[in-house]
Interface confidence: low
Amino acid sequence: EVEKTACPSGKKAREIDESLIFYKKWELEACVDAALLATQMDRVNAIPFTYEQLDVLKHKLDELYPQGYPESVIQHLGYLFLKMSPEDIRKWNVTSLETLKALLEVNKGHEMSPQVATLIDRFVKGRGQLDKDTLDTLTAFYPGYLCSLSPEELSSVPPSSIWAVRPQDLDTCDPRQLDVLYPKARLAFQNMNGSEYFVKIQSFLGGAPTEDLKALSQQNVSMDLATFMKLRTDAVLPLTVAEVQKLLGPHVEGLKAEERHRPVRDWILRQRQDDLDTLGLGLQG
């Protein structure tokens, strides 16, 4: 911690400018007024302070705002955000999407840090739900974001937000997560026509129940094998051979290559051999 020393004569900072990069740590501590720093935070990022100098500036803000920084300061933290600990961030109340974007920009190109994860959690909890604009923002910065959510967080995603979800955002989701997201997607896309609906719902089908798969089999959707392999085993098992044939359309031949893998393996074992033989693929039940 920087020692408290009197500011040398003539060194008292009147504004936050480039001259401060020549100040020693103790001079920054003694000569920069915390309130001045708070009002001119937007200038800090334009000045090439060292990490050690940034530590001093953070310390000054911490003293000024022991209960947590106001949003007016948070929005302009810039690279000083990288100095914050998750404990610091838990004290914040971030409500503006612009503030969130500004801080995510600082961390852009890096993996989600504990600081960013905490910031996002604070933001989402503060809003009470993951609205479409927030989800748009978060998945733009972190495509895997949706699949890193806990049950409580996922439950706060309203169906309207599902429109912001791209297929790649669901790449790392497992069936239990899709179980939560699928009914929301079904609700969100319910007014679309058959082929358009299938294109949108396809990424979420890992959470679909048997009755919805049966309904899709009646719509000539030609589901690809990659999607079929991600379906819940318990949802696939009750499907008849005819239903799977209709569901996959021309892709049904792909079942042979996947016959040793779930859910295909388990489904095959549930079928009558006579029915499997109608596919002409040599599948053995």
Epitope: E111, M112, S113, P114, T118, G144, C147, R176
Partner: antibody, heavy 116, light 112 residues
Framework: EVQLVESGGGLVQPGGSLRLSCAAS????????MHWVRQAPGKGLEWVGY????????EYNQKFKDRFTISADTSKNTAYLQMNSLRAEDTAVYYC?????????WGQGTLVTVSS | DIQMTQSPSSLSASVGDRVTITCKSS????????????LAWYQQKPGKAPKLLIY???TRESGVPSRFSGSGSGTDFTLTISSLQPEDFATYFC????????FGQGTKVEIK
């Protein structure tokens, strides 16, 4: 095959510290959460907390928030439980378990005994 | 936190018996958006880790024998072993994972 192997347990004096490790294999470490759950002799299961290895984000049972810290090293596929200011009532088998929602795979546990 | 209460705390039964264990949660673990009950059942044998049997209140984990079944919704749940086998003598826990993570105190199934 998913495997979770805990280590680091043993005898420690009241007021002492201990760091438990949980080495994970057989799945992608960063796409699941890692929990610590403990079980005192002859008692039920008690959730300690979890970490998202991909982000370092942690959540704790309020009861342990001040004394226990969960961390993870993604390069080693290992999660840790740092326990400080240990008390006799912390004597338990400590399990790590992975999850998405529920805890689907557990380690065999490591016994921590706090006694003078 | 949601409290989980199991009953009975222990029971004695014979091979072939039908065994029923109940679990009550202090508030509903049914999530309205997907109509799923965030409740699981585990089996634990002495000196071993808990093994997942049932999740979503009624979905059997892969590889779990069909004699194990789960039912119930909201706050009241049941684990049923239709015909007790020698390897089923163990302690059974319920677990809610909707809001944080809590467990029932366990039901020990012993040989009569």
């Amino acid at each position: 095959e998913v495997q979770l192997v805990e280590s680091g347990g043993g005898l420690v004096q009241p007021g002492g510290s201990l760091r438990l490790s949980c080495a994970a294999s057989g799945y992608t470490f960063t796409t699941y959460w890692m929990h610590w759950v403990r079980q005192a002799p002859g008692k039920g299961l008690e959730w300690v907390g979890y970490i998202r290895p991909s982000t370092g984000y942690t959540e704790y049972n309020q009861k342990f928030k001040d004394r226990f810290t969960i961390s993870a090293d993604t390069s080693k596929n290992t999660a840790y439980l740092q326990m400080n200011s240990l008390r006799a009532e912390d004597t338990a088998v400590y399990y790590c378990a992975r999850s998405r929602w529920l805890l689907d795979y557990w380690g065999q546990g490591t016994l921590v005994t706090v006694s003078s | 936190d949601i409290q989980m209460t199991q009953s009975p705390s222990s029971l004695s039964a014979s091979v072939g018996d039908r065994v029923t264990i109940t679990c009550k949660s202090s508030q509903s673990v049914l999530y309205s958006s997907n109509q799923k009950n965030y409740l699981a059942w585990y089996q634990q044998k002495p000196g071993k880790a808990p093994k997942l049997l049932i999740y979503w209140a009624s979905t059997r984990e892969s590889g779990v024998p069909s004699r194990f079944s789960g039912s119930g919704s909201g706050t009241d749940f049941t684990l049923t072993i239709s015909s007790l086998q020698p390897e089923d003598f163990a302690t059974y826990f319920c677990h809610q994972y909707l809001s944080s993570y809590t467990f029932g105190q366990g039901t020990k199934v012993e040989i009569k």
